[in-house]
Structures are given as structure tokens and as C-alpha cells.
């Protein structure tokens, strides 16, 4: 009978704790309520991962995590009668999941992916040290907008690195970018240990280069106008404008955080266009401009990947050497 048990009494442990993997890297633990829990107890479940990380107290009898399964991961679960973290939960029950078997030295290394211009993802990796040179690799990927796991078809080599690219287009007006792409690389023969990675869609984004539309002089200032890469709004980008002067052989680099086209000298209302005024430029000399962009922390987690440089554009006259 469960009569007058005090809520502070330690509850029995949860039962039937099990673990499974969905997609490529979604690990799900489920359990049943404890047997013989006191009737006046509103059950809550305390759980944390093996290293005491991500403590959680919730009423659900499941917990999931998106994690690259390159290492063993364990969840400990206990039951309690309140949301109070200081309440001692029941005996904790633990369930672990191990990565697929295989020689760790056979697994690929440096598995990383870059989302190019929010239109396709390019992943690359190095072969494991303990693998045969004729190993054939396969990359699998999954994200929320896919119904099932897909196999990447376009395997290529760049030097010692292997790679594969697949279409991944930003979906407008959705929480698409708040999610991640799950990646796994293994070999066709099943001889190597699979490698996993999770790529958050707010990081590792490399924009296409911008396109310079117009250069013009006003007094001793150089006005630069360019078109940003498709799929990006200008406030989400950070710019680097490089100006080389042929006569003085100077090389000036300007880091531009905001590039609004508010000056009357700039062509107005051109969609997705940015502008910058370079001060103190000699109009009677040849000036060559190029621009590159990268994502900023306003919209993205990562701000390390510069685009390639734009095509150069020049303005002014090349002086004759006397």
C-alpha cells in the first residue's frame, strides 16, 4: 500500500531504461515509471549524462540528445517527487551506448563540413591511419527536412583529403537553420570504424564572393558599390575591402561592419547591394579594388570563414613612367 509516504522519501528506481539511435546521431533513452512509487507523489525524473553534464528534471519518461557517436555516452536517470534539485532522487539507473565497433585508428579523421553559400554542403576527411589505400568511402547525411538518411554521391579527392558534396538549400521562413546536419562516414566493405559529426547550420558557412558593381570618384574619395552573394542579407555579413594603388604601391585593407548605401553618390534602392567610401584616394592613379565577405555573429555562430575574393575592378589612370 502507498498510504502516507512523505514526499521527501526516496523513490524506487525507474524501470526498463533502454537506449536507441534514430537517424545517424539522435540518441534516445526511454524508461518506465518506478514500480511501487508512493501515490501522493507527482513523479519527476532527474537525469544527467555520465560526466554530470546537462542535468535535467522533467516529467517525461524519455530524453534525447544529438551527439556524434564517436565515444561511449551514458545517461543516469532517477525518480523524485518534485522539481526541487536538492531533493535526493531514487537510486540512479544508468544506460550507455557505445560507438560502432572497429579499430579507432581505422576511422577517418578531420571530418568537417562547410555550408557553401547556404546552397550546398561540402564535407571532407582524411583516411584513418590503419586503413588500406584502396578503401572506398561512403558519406551519409540527415537533417530535419529529410524523411530518411541520404547517401552522398559526389565523392572526390583534394590532395590527401576525401570529400563529398550534397545539395542543402536554406528553407525560407522556417526554423531550418536552428537545426543541424548529422554526418557519418564509413567504408563500403565495413572494415573501418564509422566516424560521425554534427554540423550546426549556424556555423561553418562560407558565402560566395561578392560582385563589384561600380567604382566612382568624388573629390578624393573612392565610392565602392557591390552586390552581396545570393541567400545573404547585408546585415548578416562582414566585409573586407582591399585597395591597391599602382603608383604609390600602397595596399590598404578596410574592415567594414556596416556597408549601407546612404550617400547620394551611390545608386539607390538596389536590392542586396552594399557600399563603402574609401577616403583619400588619388583619382589620377590606377586603383584596384577587391572585396570578400564572411558571416557575422549577428546572424551566425561562426565568423571565421571568408569567401573567396571578388573579381578585381580598377579605376583611374595608370601613369606613364617618365
Amino acid at each position: 500500500g502507498g498510504g502516507g509516504a512523505a514526499p521527501t522519501e526516496t523513490q524506487p528506481p525507474v524501470t526498463n531504461l533502454s537506449v536507441s539511435v534514430e537517424n545517424l546521431c539522435t540518441v534516445i533513452w526511454t524508461w518506465n515509471p518506478p514500480e511501487g512509487a508512493s501515490s501522493n507523489c507527482s513523479l519527476w525524473y532527474f537525469s544527467h549524462f555520465g560526466d554530470k553534464q546537462d542535468k535535467k528534471i522533467a516529467p517525461e519518461t524519455r530524453r534525447s540528445i544529438e551527439v556524434p557517436l564517436n565515444e561511449r555516452i551514458c545517461l543516469q536517470v532517477g525518480s523524485q517527487c518534485s522539481t526541487n534539485e536538492s531533493e535526493k532522487p531514487s537510486i540512479l539507473v544508468e544506460k550507455c551506448i557505445s560507438p560502432p565497433e572497429g579499430d579507432p585508428e581505422s576511422a577517418v579523421t578531420e571530418l568537417q563540413c562547410i555550408w557553401h553559400n547556404l546552397s550546398y554542403m561540402k564535407c571532407s576527411w582524411l583516411p584513418g591511419r590503419n586503413t588500406s589505400p584502396d578503401t572506398n568511402y561512403t558519406l551519409y547525411y540527415w537533417h530535419r527536412s529529410l524523411e530518411k538518411i541520404h547517401q552522398c554521391e559526389n565523392i572526390f579527392r583534394e590532395g590527401q583529403y576525401f570529400g563529398c558534396s550534397f545539395d542543402l538549400t536554406k528553407v525560407k521562413d522556417s526554423s531550418f537553420e536552428q537545426h543541424s546536419v548529422q554526418i557519418m562516414v564509413k567504408d563500403n566493405a565495413g572494415k573501418i570504424k564509422p566516424s560521425f559529426n554534427i554540423v550546426p547550420l549556424t556555423s561553418r558557412v562560407k558565402p560566395d564572393p561578392p560582385h563589384i558593381k561600380n567604382l566612382s570618384f568624388h573629390n578624393d574619395d573612392l565610392y565602392v558599390q557591390w552586390e552581396n552573394p545570393q541567400n545573404f542579407i547585408s546585415r548578416c555579413l562582414f566585409y573586407e575591402v582591399e585597395v591597391n594603388n599602382s603608383q604609390t604601391e600602397t595596399h590598404n585593407v578596410f574592415y567594414v561592419q556596416e556597408a549601407k548605401c546612404e550617400n547620394p553618390e551611390f545608386e539607390r534602392n538596389v536590392e542586396n547591394t552594399s557600399c563603402f567610401m574609401v577616403p583619400g584616394v588619388l583619382p589620377d592613379t590606377l586603383n584596384t579594388v577587391r572585396i570578400r565577405v564572411k558571416t557575422n555573429k549577428l546572424c551566425y555562430e561562426d565568423d571565421k570563414l571568408w569567401s573567396n575574393w571578388s573579381q578585381e575592378m580598377s579605376i583611374g589612370k595608370k601613369r606613364n613612367s617618365t
Epitope: 582524411l126 583516411p127 591511419r129 588500406s132 583534394e158 590527401q160
Partner: antibody, heavy 118, light 107 residues
Framework: EVQVLESGGGLVQPGGSLRLSCAAS????????MTWVRQAPGKGLEWVST????????YYADSVKGRFTISRDNSKNTVYLQMNSLRAEDTAVYYC???????????WGRGTLVTVSS | EIVLTQSPDFQSVTPKEKVTITCRAS??????LHWYQQKPDQSPKLLIK???QSFSGVPSRFSGSGSGTDFTLTINSLEAEDAAAYYC?????????FGQGTKLEIK
Amino acid sequence: EVQVLESGGGLVQPGGSLRLSCAASGFTFSNYAMTWVRQAPGKGLEWVSTISGRGYSIYYADSVKGRFTISRDNSKNTVYLQMNSLRAEDTAVYYCAKEEGHWYFDVWGRGTLVTVSS
Amino acid sequence: EIVLTQSPDFQSVTPKEKVTITCRASQSIGSSLHWYQQKPDQSPKLLIKYASQSFSGVPSRFSGSGSGTDFTLTINSLEAEDAAAYYCMNSLGLPYTFGQGTKLEIK
């Protein structure tokens, strides 16, 4: 033409330091691991250290672990070997080599001589 | 660590002769074995990759064979310019290891 060229060797006292450089040209530097191999006078070849193309994976021979540091600057197409706490047994010609494929060395530099002596 | 043992350590041969150098690994390394040639006062040069694949630009008289633990470098019809030290190298796992070398002298 694919080339690698070492520099920075010389005479150093035991316990001293030296930094070797290896400048590469003629290939996409960041796509290839670079390796240092040494050869003591009149002896065979000994692998010293390797750094992967992007610099994320670094490996050392037990004989130099904790004393030598390999690094690379992909913007300069250069790999470095910082050698600290040098010993007499580190005396050797140090070769820089470009790795290819499944870990073989297809291009070697001419080598730079490091002499550790008091 | 995988130990490579070459034999012979030294060989004196006459031009046009066929030369065989062997390399034995302390454990199976598949085809992850490569052969290098080092002429006096020069840096090593790749001859054979993956046990049997000739590297580009290497004369056809050089060939390699074997897999697992036993490997062979063969020089058919030796030429005077082949006087050098020859090294086998294992690249399966780390550390990379070299054989002790075989010095080839032309009579």
C-alpha cells in the same frame, strides 16, 4: 614544379633551441600533410613528425615528443619544426617531405644540417 | 611499432645484373610499404609506392612486389647510376618506420 626547401639548420649547444622552416611551392599546400624525417651522419632515415594539411592532426616520434613542435602556416606555404632541449643525438640532416596519398613521401627537400655540440 | 628488416645490408654488384632487396615487416601491413632510393649526398627519392606501384618518372627496371609481411624490390639490369642506399618504409599506422637500408655498390 613541386618543391620543398628547408632552412634554419646550424650549430647549437646541448639544451639549446633551433627553428627549422620548410617553404613549399607548386601544389595546393593545405591539401597535403608535411613531414620531417632526419638522418644522423652515416645512419638510416628516422621519421620525426607529421602535420596534416589543415594542421588539426599532429604526430611525433617518441624520441622527440615534448621537445619538438611542428606547425604550419598555410597562408605562407610553410611548415616549421621548433626544436627545444636539443641533445647530441639530435644531430642529423633534417629533411622536409610532402606526403601524398595514403602516407608516402613523394617530394623531399635537400635537407638542412643540425649539429648539437658543445 | 612495426619493425622493418632489410636484407642484405650491403651488396656489391656488376652492371646489367639483376638485384633483389627484401624487406620483412614484424606484422602484416598489407600494401602500405614504399621504397626509396638515396644517392650519396642527396635526399631520398620515391621509387615504389604501395609495395608494387611504380612512381612516375622512375625507370622501368625498378619493380616492387609483396604484401602482408614480405616485400621485394627488384632492379633488372642494374646501371651504374643505381649505386645508392635503398630504404623500405611502412606507413600503416604510426610511427612511420624505415628499414635499416641496403647499400648497393657497383663493381
